[in-house]
Structures are given as structure tokens and as C-alpha cells.
Interface confidence: medium
């Protein structure tokens, strides 16, 4: 050929028509071309139709060209990769009817600000998907629906802040996933879902440590060895991995995987979602209940006592332990008071009027002082319906896990708890009139009812706040009937879910540190 | 039965240094990363500094970079904590706390009982 080079081998003919200078496909190329390069050259428009009577054409290298617009119009039937990486494209073509076979598509370093939801319709065959170097802030939730076969996937070196949740959903082929070096700060509850990944790269992310980070440190701890740092130019299968590597942008480059999260609920771990619950591991002296470790649970109904400590924050970050470096949109709070104000490790905490009644009684609640939300037991945020639940019942009890094997596992997503819990013995009655009551916006303030037992000795027992306490002392709700040794118990008021998609809002009702 | 013992604390001017120590017992404590946390009066509890297992890996809270070193001895079962150039508001009740056993806990695992370092001229 005059112009491109031409090579045969095996059954494969490869035309490799690069830096020719080239602003539109050069004519008379062989009819049976299954390769064809075109790189680096100043097409700037393509039209893929040009190349329809290519009809054995399997691979196309349209990279480095200056495309700003590619046209798709015709079939290439049995296309299989399509390179057009390194041009200026603002928007994904639409792939899927002109190129039904298509398995490797790499639009990496354009100038994609975002993606439609039906980008990718058609391209059922799609094994590898390369995004790398754009501009995408965020993806429309179904993206990959219409990719089930996708193995690689690279969204790396773009501007995304946050991932949709359901964004990995039925791929179960991918092997590969490339995250690293974009504006991520958490990632939601179940991306992963419970198939195995052997390659992630998540380095080079302002990854936000506070409560909404612990699924993905969970994540990271049962899948550390699969956590990779980028090379450029290494085969993946050679390169080392390093969990380390994904650190919290907050906290002095701290490993994400090892970030504390005191006193956080176990949001990674749990399937309900809606109130704290806390059950020390006991070690018993005497009558003295001694706590020595807490474990934080979610049960699905309310259960408070006559007697209550109020208090209430604002939703500035409470991640105390690591208030030095907060997230750019976060403010640090001035006022921190601990809760009670002289609460520390050892201290033996005596009540003598708290009592806790054997048999639950139904009592009305008073209104609310203006400054704090009317407590209301909320729904569980990941069941099916969101009316609140005006009944509380008595949650079964929960122990402590077990711990996790040594040895990670796939964490495969806990199914939704169900709406009513089973109950221990009586369940509480309805109150007399079940109204549901408005659920409070963010602007309110979270608001946590705290009541004690007796006689506690905590090994260390720290609550932080950012504005006073103060008491409520008609404040009155139902009591369970106790099966248990006495344990501290809490209530979370406010809508949980009503924050959740405000990263910098929602998390911070995590810090009530651990007995 | 898993202890922290923390020592070293005292009232030191401002500028000064001071160490403290953290003798850990009941549990394997080179198999666990190591924290040391603060409390000042009236305020919450403040990270300050982790080591990894090894020692080789070190994080501190911006508030004390390039003041506070943390290390440990695995053969001696010891956190310890050097603290230079002391401020006021370094003034804190200081725990050493031990890591979590499993991902399925959350927060530290022990505590010590805490060394009272004060801060004054």
C-alpha cells in the first residue's frame, strides 16, 4: 500500500497506518484488514461507517488522532477492540448498535465530564473498559447494567467524588477495578458486593475516616491482599500489594484499613441501621458490671428508659479523634464537653434512682423542649418501607461476633432485617395513639437519649459533644422488659437516612466512644 | 487478662520534653498496632499518634507532627511516646490503647488507665 504498511500474520492482515499525517482514512486498503492502526494522526472527525466494507476488521486504533467527534453510523459486526484514547472527545459515542462485538474499549485521557445512563446499551460482549485521565465527576447508576461481562474496568485519574451504589452490580467476571487518583472520600455501603475483586487500586483518593468509611474498611481488611499500588507500565500480576496505600486524607495519611472508628455503629457489618445499641463484653465482680469492650449493634425499635440524658450536637465533623485535619467542607467545632463532664476510664458511675421496671409500661411523652427533636423510633434505612414504626418492640438480644478468620473472605452483603424483630418474652403495647411523626430534615441536630445501669465501672468511657448537655428529666418512653444483665443502652433520634447522602453531614453522629 | 500500664506523665514547662511508657501484657503485643490518645480537661478524646506492628510504619495527628515520636519495643512488650517542645495544650490525661483483635469490633480494644501530663510554667 502507498501509504500504510502492511503485514500478514498467521490469518490476521495488519495495516498500521500511524503518523502519516492522516485527516481522513487513506482509500484503497486491503478488503480483509482485521487490524487496523491509525494512531497519531489529525483526523479530528471519524466516521465509522467509512469502514464498513472492512467486514473482517476485529481491532481499530483511532488513538492519539485529536478526535473531538466520532460518528457512529453503520455495523462493524465483529469489531472487537476500539482504541481511542488520548483525543479530545466531550462524550461517549453510542456504541452499542454499530459495534455489537465489541470487547475492549479504551477512551481513556479525552475530555468525558459524564456519562449518559444508556452509554453503554448494546455492548453485551464488553469485557474491558478503560476511562482513565477524563474529567467525570460523577456515573449514572446503571452504567454497567448493560456490560455483565465485564472483567476490567478503569475509572482512574478522573474527578469523581462519589461512586453509585449499585455501580459493580452483577459483574461477576470483574477482576480488575482501577479507582485510584480521583476526589472519592467514602465508598457506599456494598459496592463490592460479595464476589471476589483480585485487583483493586484505590491509592490517591482524600479517602474521608470517619463512621461512613467503616464498610470500606472492612472491605479493605478481609480483601488486603488484593489491594494493589499503580505502576505504570508493570504487568498487575507482578506487582506487590499494599493495603497501606489507601489512607485517610483527614488523619496524617493514616491506612484506612486500620482507621479506629471508635465508637462508630457497626455500619459495615450490620443490617439494620436505625438506632445504637450497646453491649459491653462483661466481666462480672461482685454486683459491679464491668465493661471491658463494646460492641455497637443497630436494633430496629427504641428502648429508653424514665430517666434520660440528653444531649445534642452539631454536624461538624466529632471524629475526636482525629480533629485536627477535617475534610474541606467540614468546620471544626470549638466547644467540646465530655459526657458526663468527668467521665474517665475506671471511674464507677453510681445512679441509685435510676431503676429499670421488669414489666414495660406505656406511658405518653411530654412535648419536647423547641431545642431538641421529639425522640421517634425510626425505620431501619435499609428496609423497603420508610413510614415510621410507632410501635417499639423489644429487639432480640444480640452478643457479641465472633471474630473473623485470619484468612479473608468475600463479605457478602447482609440480607434486610426484617420490619418487626422478633421479640424476647412481651413485646412493649402500641402507644395509645400512634401518630407517625414528621421526620426531621438536617438541619435538626441528632439527638441521643443515653441511660445507664446502676452500677457501671467503664474501662473507658467517652462520649463527645460540641454543645452542652443538658437534662430532661420528664422525658419518658417505654422500657423492654430486661432478660440481660443491665446494660448501657442508647437511643439515636434524628433520621439517619435524611443525612446519608450528605457525606458531611450524616457521619458524624458516629462518635460515641466505646466502654 | 489483657493490661496497659502507662507511666512517665508529670508537670513539665513549656518546651520541655517528657516520655512516656505504656507496659503491655496478656496478649501478643507485637502481633498489634498501638495508639496513644488524649484527653484535655473539658474536651473530647484526640488521637494523637498509631505504630504499626512492626514499628515501621508511623502516623501522628497534625497537632503534634514533628513534637511527639511514637515507637515501641516488641522484645520488651513497651509503647512508648517521646514528647518534645511541649505546649499548653498538650496538657491531657494520655491512654495507651491496643488494637482491635478482629474487623468485626469496633474501637479500641484496651485501654490503660491513663498518665495526667500537665503543661505549665
Known amino acids: 500500500h502507498p501509504i500504510c504498511e502492511v503485514s500478514k500474520v498467521a490469518s490476521h492482515l495488519e495495516v498500521n497506518c500511524d503518523k502519516r499525517n492522516l485527516t481522513a482514512l487513506p482509500p484503497d486498503l486491503p478488503k480483509d484488514t482485521t487490524i487496523l492502526h491509525l494512531s497519531e494522526n489529525l483526523l479530528y472527525t471519524f466516521s465509522l461507517a467509512t469502514l464498513m466494507p472492512y467486514t473482517r476488521l476485529t481491532q481499530l486504533n483511532l488513538d492519539r488522532c485529536e478526535l473531538t467527534k466520532l460518528q457512529v453510523d453503520g455495523t462493524l459486526p465483529v469489531l472487537g477492540t476500539l482504541d481511542l484514547s488520548h483525543n479530545q472527545l466531550q462524550s461517549l459515542p453510542l456504541l452499542g448498535q454499530t459495534l455489537p462485538a465489541l470487547t475492549v474499549l479504551d477512551v481513556s485521557f479525552n475530555r468525558l465530564t459524564s456519562l449518559p445512563l444508556g452509554a453503554l446499551r448494546g455492548l453485551g460482549e464488553l469485557q474491558e473498559l478503560y476511562l482513565k485521565g477524563n474529567e467525570l465527576k460523577t456515573l449514572p447508576p446503571g452504567l454497567l447494567t448493560p456490560t455483565p461481562k465485564l472483567e476490567k474496568l478503569s475509572l482512574a485519574n478522573n474527578n469523581l467524588t462519589e461512586l453509585p451504589a449499585g455501580l459493580l452490580n452483577g459483574l461477576e467476571n470483574l477482576d480488575t477495578l482501577l479507582l485510584q487518583e480521583n476526589s472519592l472520600y467514602t465508598i457506599p455501603k456494598g459496592f463490592f458486593g460479595s464476589h471476589l475483586l483480585p485487583f483493586a487500586f484505590l491509592h490517591g483518593n482524600p479517602w474521608l475516616c470517619n463512621c461512613e468509611i467503616l464498610y470500606f474498611r472492612r472491605w479493605l481488611q478481609d480483601n488486603a491482599e488484593n489491594v494493589y499500588v499503580w505502576k505504570q507500565g508493570v504487568d498487575v500480576k507482578a506487582m506487590t500489594s499494599n493495603v497501606a496505600s489507601v489512607q485517610c486524607d483527614n488523619s496524617d495519611k493514616f491506612p484506612v484499613y486500620k482507621y479506629p472508628g471508635k465508637g462508630c455503629p457497626t455500619l459495615g457489618d450490620e443490617g439494620d441501621t436505625d438506632l445504637y445499641d450497646y453491649y459491653p463484653e462483661e466481666d462480672t465482680e461482685g454486683d459491679k458490671v464491668r465493661a471491658t469492650r463494646t460492641v455497637v449493634k443497630f436494633p430496629t425499635k427504641a428502648h429508653t428508659t424514665p430517666w434520660g440524658l440528653f444531649y445534642s450536637w452539631s454536624t461538624a465533623s466529632l471524629d475526636s479523634q482525629m480533629p485536627s485535619s477535617l475534610h474541606p467542607t467540614q468546620e471544626s467545632t470549638k466547644e467540646q464537653t465530655t459526657f458526663p463532664p468527668r467521665w474517665t476510664p475506671n471511674f464507677t458511675l453510681h445512679m441509685e434512682s435510676i431503676t429499670f421496671s421488669k414489666t414495660p409500661k406505656s406511658t405518653t411523652e411530654p412535648t419536647p423542649s423547641p431545642t431538641t427533636s421529639e425522640p421517634v423510633p425510626e425505620p431501619a434505612p435499609n428496609m423497603t418501607t420508610l413510614e415510621p414504626t410507632p410501635s417499639p418492640t423489644t429487639p432480640e438480644p444480640t452478643s457479641e461476633p465472633a471474630p473473623s478468620p485470619t484468612t479473608p473472605e468475600p463479605t457478602s452483603e447482609p440480607a434486610p432485617s426484617p420490619t418487626t424483630p422478633e421479640p424476647t418474652s412481651e413485646p412493649a403495647p402500641s402507644p395509645t395513639t400512634p401518630e407517625p411523626t414528621p421526620i426531621p430534615t438536617i438541619a435538626t441536630s441528632p439527638t441521643i437519649l443515653v441511660s445507664a445501669t446502676s452500677l457501671i465501672t467503664p474501662k473507658s468511657t467517652f462520649l463527645t459533644t460540641t454543645k452542652p448537655v443538658s437534662l430532661l428529666e420528664s422525658t419518658k418512653k417505654t422500657i423492654p422488659e430486661l432478660d440481660q444483665p443491665p446494660k448501657l443502652r442508647g437511643v439515636l433520634q434524628g433520621h439517619l437516612e435524611s443525612s446519608r447522602n450528605d457525606p458531611f453531614l450524616h457521619p458524624d453522629f458516629c462518635c460515641l466512644l466505646p466502654l | 487478662e489483657v493490661q496497659l500500664v502507662e507511666s512517665g506523665g508529670g508537670l513539665v514547662q513549656p518546651g520541655g520534653s517528657l516520655r512516656l511508657s505504656c507496659a503491655a501484657s496478656g496478649f501478643t503485643f507485637s502481633s498489634y498496632w498501638m495508639y496513644w490518645v488524649r484527653q484535655a480537661p473539658g474536651k473530647g478524646l484526640e488521637w494523637v499518634s498509631a505504630?504499626?506492628?512492626?514499628?515501621?510504619?508511623?502516623y501522628y495527628a497534625d497537632s503534634v507532627k514533628g513534637r511527639f515520636t511514637i515507637s515501641r519495643d516488641n522484645a520488651k512488650n513497651t509503647l512508648y511516646l517521646q514528647m518534645n517542645s511541649l505546649k499548653s495544650e498538650d496538657t491531657a490525661v494520655y491512654y495507651c490503647?491496643?488494637?482491635?483483635?478482629?474487623?468485626?469490633?469496633?474501637?479500641?480494644?484496651?485501654w490503660g488507665q491513663g498518665t495526667q501530663v500537665t503543661v505549665s510554667s
Open positions: 490503647a491496643k488494637d482491635l483483635p478482629n474487623s468485626d469490633s469496633l474501637g479500641y480494644d484496651y
Open positions: 505504630i504499626n506492628t512492626g514499628g515501621g510504619s508511623t
